[in-house]
Amino acid sequence: CKAMHVAQPAVVLASSRGIASFVCEYASPGKATEVRVTVLRQADSQVTEVCAATYMMGNELTFLDDSICTGTSSGNQVNLTIQGLRAMDTGLYICKVELMYPPPYYLGIGNGTQIYVIDPEPCPDSDF
């Protein structure tokens, strides 16, 4: 057994449409067949769940229909996209990876990605 390491970028800038994408990579110590990936937002000491998905290795990552997240998986790498972000959503987004099956269970937590969101300036009215 060895601890599971999770890597994610330190900083990401959301697009003007409020979309942020980043890669969450984990060093799997075992041959997991079922993996759960959770995105958490940490503000002060409060940690809230943004979205979560469980997938079988080799299959696609599927978030719930009403989730603000989408993602794809490739080996030990998950490409995550969070949409609908606004300036007030700027914060630290932590990637949490759990190897659910087979035993033993492993937990890995990334250091977090600081996502900066800048609301677009409203278009000035045009006089014709």
Partner: antibody
Framework: QVQLVESGGGVVQPGMSLRLSCAAS????????MHWVRQAPGKGLEWVAV????????HYADSVKGRFTISRDSSKNTLYLQMNSLRAEDTAVYYC???????????WGQGTLVTVSS | EIVLTQSPGTLSLSPGERATLSCRAS???????LAWYQQKPGQAPRLLIY???SRATGIPDRFSGSGSGTDFTLTISRLEPEDFAVYYC?????????FGPGTKVDIK
Amino acid sequence: QVQLVESGGGVVQPGMSLRLSCAASGFTFSSYGMHWVRQAPGKGLEWVAVIWYDGNNRHYADSVKGRFTISRDSSKNTLYLQMNSLRAEDTAVYYCARGGRLGAFDYWGQGTLVTVSS
Amino acid sequence: EIVLTQSPGTLSLSPGERATLSCRASQSVSSSCLAWYQQKPGQAPRLLIYGASSRATGIPDRFSGSGSGTDFTLTISRLEPEDFAVYYCQQYGISPFTFGPGTKVDIK
């Protein structure tokens, strides 16, 4: 506020069965892993079992594997521990605990005492 | 399984003194997955520190955690009367999740 309340403890004879319950309130029960931890009289803490999220995955300590079954009913916000073939060494206070967002056990019940004695 | 060893077994100190508790793992533990709990007689454990160094909600700043790999430390900068209790470290990164045997901090 988060609350966990265990029940079902008592005195049983070796070889008998007992089912513990843990009623949860104040949080979205199905979104958290839930654990049982026990403490023998005058001893330290021993992790017993965990059930994850939707209830499909469970893990157990070797000392209880094959004898204890952890389960959950999300419609009732209740966690269970079915204990079969009880032994004297299972005598302990049994706590249910919530696995927090970042994994540590952030909330605990007050515990229920199980005594296995002939 | 990962075995956690705590030292000393008992620490006898006076209020106002500094307490340093050690937790050593039999193999490397992710610092994200190391916690400290406080337990008083007749009570359930209470989470103090998670992720080796982050204080849980409502925990006073006299409690601090540090360490990585196999060596972790809980420090209580100035002991208050209510801090005399048993302290357990725990790893929750790999099942089975394991606790150390505990360090009892008692009044000298």
